[in-house]
Amino acid sequence: VSITKCNSDMNGYCLHGQCIYLVDMSQNYCRCEVGYTGVRCEHFYL
């Protein structure tokens, strides 16, 4: 799978994680920090 950094317009898309652009899938993906989940890493879990 080809990946690259998200475009600058997606700054802030991932609330608690790193934004990755999955080129072949035509979508952005949030790689969440430890303790966070959700499509945009918006949920905290213990």
Partner: antibody, heavy 116, light 106 residues
Amino acid sequence: QDQLVQSGAEVKKPGASVKVSCKASGFNIKDTYIQWVRQAPGQGLEWMGRIDPLRGNTKYREKFEGRVTITADTSTNTAYMELSSLRSEDTAVYYCVRSGTLFDFWGQGTLVTVSS
Amino acid sequence: DIQMTQSPSSLSASVGDRVTITCKASQDIHKYIAWYQQKPGQAPRLLIQYTSTLQPGVPSRFSGSGSGTDYTFTISSLQPEDIATYYCLQYDNRRTFGGGTKVEIK
């Protein structure tokens, strides 16, 4: 199946406002950004602005600042675009477009006609 | 706002011809460019995103290339069904469409 269903055609007088809705089904708008694009008859595509429904943040094209308001109601999974002080040049098809989790998934378009 | 200068605004070519459309950005857009096809009365159809990634179901005669500020869209062998208007879109910083290229058959 993911869908963006827009409200029906509108006819407005110059100086009036119009509010176009864009209801999402099959996905949560909080996971996406919703863009708005318009196309006047026989003209090209023009980006107007976008909203991040999760945070409520908006970005607008400079030429529309102060005249366009994009909002989202996450409880109904619906985005809105309101354009005020309408003039004849605002006659166009207005599209909502999902981006973020999927690159550019378009609504069917809403024709807004501005005529006295 | 980033400006996108698309050329030519229209072109006429024969079936089987190679067709090339260019878009020049006013600043580096880091390969974040997409190409759309629009036929009369229809919503735009995404053909290519991230400069060269073809969308599923899009014929391989369509391709894209470029980097920095200069980008190219190519139809390697023009077919009658390719008659449409084509638009580039930069999506690096906000969004800007090119002015469009109307492709006709000679």
